[in-house]
């Protein structure tokens, strides 16, 4: 930022690293909760047509896949990895890909992933081959 730009106090719209650099915000698919046909596949596209500028630069992309007796839904949002989402920590927030991991939720099958490359929650990956620290 040019030197004349005032530094804001207690404002998380502007995230800086130790050198005072400003972080560009993430671009994520952001359709909230939608019905999905994604089932029994190694990977799926979100079919979300909305790409949003995440409000806060520390936010990452998140996808949540849920299946119960009635339907399947896919949720796509931006979220701050310092805060839990659906009561779970976003432990994979630094990943460039959205690798789905199953979480224990009573009465449903629940998978969640987070990632930090642009629109990375558009392609959600269930395949086990990615779940062993695959850098790609």
């Amino acid at each position: 930022i040019p030197p004349h730009v005032q530094k804001s106090v207690n404002n998380d719209m502007m995230v800086t690293d130790n050198n005072g650099a400003v972080k560009f915000p993430q671009l994520c698919k952001f359709c909230d909760v939608r019905f999905s046909t994604c089932d029994n596949q190694k990977s799926c596209l979100s079919n979300c047509s909305i790409t949003s500028i995440c409000e806060k630069p520390q936010e990452v992309c998140v996808a949540v896949w849920r299946k119960n007796d009635e339907n399947i839904t896919l949720e796509t949002v931006c979220h701050d990895p310092k805060l839990p989402y659906h009561d779970f920590i976003l432990e994979d927030a630094a990943s460039p890909k959205c690798i789905m991991k199953e979480k224990k939720k009573p009465g449903e099958t629940f998978f969640m992933c987070s990632c930090s490359s642009d629109e990375c929650n558009d392609n959600i990956i269930f395949s086990e081959e990615y779940n062993t620290s695959n850098p790609d």
Partner: nanobody, 124 residues
Framework: EVQLLESGGGLVQPGGSLRLSCAAS???????RMWWVRQAPGKGLEWVS?????????YYADSVKGRFTISRDNSKNTLYLQMNSLRAEDTAVYYC?????????????????WGQGTLVTVSS
């Protein structure tokens, strides 16, 4: 060294329109995603809109969707922001910024990545 220079700011009444421009010197304009960023008095940065270099795909913050339109003319090395239905809360200094592929941070004071800003005041 590429420099970014904004223009088009000014005083406008609520409901009015303004068109901001950002002229980039240098020949690498087409390699960068371009952003409009604003900072209201005493507030932090708000990332308003972005546009891709190829295909010109656009992105908007929720606060300006349907009112602002970003565009670029790569032949003129110029970025634009058409602002309609302006509100008092749009009052801010507006900056253009450029982002290289896979770039996550930009250092303070990099005038080749940030313009000096143009003030937009929405008031009756």
């Amino acid at each position: 060294e590429v420099q970014l220079l904004e223009s088009g700011g000014g005083l406008v009444q609520p409901g009015g329109s303004l068109r901001l421009s950002c002229a980039a010197s240098g020949s690498t304009f087409t390699e960068y995603r371009m952003w409009w960023v604003r900072q209201a008095p005493g507030k932090g940065l708000e990332w308003v809109s972005a546009i891709e270099p190829i295909g010109h795909r656009t992105y908007y913050a929720d606060s300006v969707k349907g009112r602002f339109t970003i565009s670029r003319d790569n032949s003129k090395n110029t970025l634009y922001l058409q602002m309609n239905s302006l509100r008092a809360e749009d009052t801010a200094v507006y900056y253009c910024a450029k982002q290289a592929p896979n770039q996550r941070y930009v250092a303070r004071g990099r005038l080749d990545y940030w313009g000096q800003g143009t003030l937009v005041t929405v008031s009756s």
